[in-house]
Interface confidence: low
């Protein structure tokens, strides 16, 4: 028969013959021959290969460098890489999460719309009319102005996006 020009799934072409690829978690030691199957060996400790492959070396697991604010979210296996995430209060600077930065705080006049995660920064929003924030915070939302009426008080000083209203006693009409 004619030697193949293409091979099946999970095979590779070498010297005009089709050999089996190594399964995820294993690396290639020697190609198949007429009478022997492809020889593969498991990846070592802290190594992985995540696809059917003919690699002669496994990839090193990613190192989650604590000096960059990183910690292990999911330990790597022989078939998967280690997944890093950021320490509490920090988030990744990229999708690959190669380093971390401190979560952004929302300035006075702004409240937290979405609290930061290990992979996304804090999202701030301006406090709308009727709400305020007087602190710089990565957690605090805009708070509603105090309702003087419910306390049987009147507004003595109007609120802003950074300050609450100031309530005072109602002026009593003299008899």
């Amino acid at each position: 028969p004619e030697p193949p020009t293409a091979c099946r799934e999970k095979q590779y072409l070498i010297n005009s013959q089709c050999c089996s690829l190594c399964q995820p978690g294993q690396k290639l030691v020697s190609d198949c021959t007429e009478f022997t199957e492809t020889e593969c060996l498991p990846c070592g400790e802290s190594e992985f290969l995540d696809t059917w492959n003919r690699e002669t070396h496994c990839h090193q697991h990613k190192y989650c460098d604590p000096n960059l604010g990183l910690r292990v979210q999911q330990k790597g296996t022989s078939e998967t890489d280690t997944i890093c995430t950021c320490e509490e209060g920090w988030h990744c600077t990229s999708e690959a999460c190669e380093s971390c930065v401190l979560h952004r705080s929302c300035s006075p006049g702004f409240g937290v719309k979405q609290i930061a995660t290990g992979v996304s920064d804090t999202i701030c929003e301006p406090c709308p009319v009727g709400f305020f924030s007087n602190v710089s915070s990565a957690f605090e939302k805009c708070h509603p102005w105090t309702s003087c009426e419910t306390k049987d008080l009147v507004v003595q000083q109007a609120g802003t996006n950074k300050t609450d209203v100031v309530c005072g006693p109602q002026d009593r009409l003299r008899a």
């Epitope: 028969p1 099946r8 005009s16 089996s20 399964q23 021959t33 593969c40």
Partner: antibody
């Protein structure tokens, strides 16, 4: 139907030679690797040799290396084993068997899926 | 060379009852492609061997479904769910991963 028929067995003295043949029919002989397997009287199966579909690759058991030669003639659909310097321990029924895979498709292996009826070799003085 | 070890070497069976044969290899028969390169053969009295199971668990063409192969790596089992009188003979495992091919010693199955 698919068939393998061995011949050439017989009684031979130690140190002499013998050639066994295995004629294939019912399938495309040139697409298949072929084996010789033997069985001494009252004993188990012992693998002897294999030849690739095109005759380019051959392997032998240590017990016969240097004395036996496996070959094939695809134009005659025939497998051979030339046995020289025969010993008493070569006494056995010799079977040819087909390696069940197509051409160079190494991914498909289907066992030794067709066997001949066997031919008896007796090495005795 | 890979050494194949079968047990038991003799197995008296009762028709209609299940039977099981074990085969162990001195090294793994599971290469990177995920297939186990282990075959089972039956040699009935006075006959040539015949293929029963290839690649550990695949029944050969025409083999009754009462025969099944299982196992992985170095430990394999041939099971007959309900033995029939025609199943008597010697069962051999063979590794097909490397040359030289090597067979187990054989397990003789006979009716009680």
């Amino acid at each position: 139907q698919v068939q393998l028929v061995e011949s050439g067995g017989g009684v031979v003295q130690p140190g002499r030679s013998l050639r066994l043949s295995c004629v294939a029919s019912g399938f495309t002989f040139s697409n298949y690797g072929m084996h010789w397997v033997r069985q001494a009287p009252g004993k188990g199966l012992e693998w002897v040799a294999i030849i690739s579909y095109d005759g380019s690759n051959k392997y032998y058991a240590d017990s016969v290396k240097g004395r036996f030669t496996i070959s094939r003639d695809n134009s005659k659909n025939t497998l051979y084993v030339q046995m020289n310097s025969l010993r008493a321990e070569d006494t056995a029924v010799y079977y040819c068997a087909r390696r069940g895979h197509y051409g160079r498709d190494y991914y498909s292996y289907y066992g030794l899926d067709v066997w001949g009826q066997g031919t008896t070799v007796t090495v005795s003085s | 060379d890979i050494v194949m070890t079968q047990s038991p070497l003799s197995l008296p069976v009762t028709p209609g009852e299940p039977a099981s044969i074990s085969c162990r290899s001195s090294q793994s028969l599971l290469p990177g492609n995920g297939y186990n390169y282990l075959d089972w053969y039956l040699q009935k009295p006075g006959q040539s061997p015949q293929l029963l199971i290839y690649l550990g668990s695949n029944r050969a063409s025409g083999v009754p479904d009462r025969f099944s192969g299982s196992g992985s790596g170095t430990d394999f089992t041939l099971k007959i769910s309900r033995v029939e009188a025609e199943d008597v003979g010697v069962y051999y495992c063979m590794q097909a991963l490397q040359t030289p091919r090597t067979f187990g010693q054989g397990t003789k199955v006979e009716i009680k």
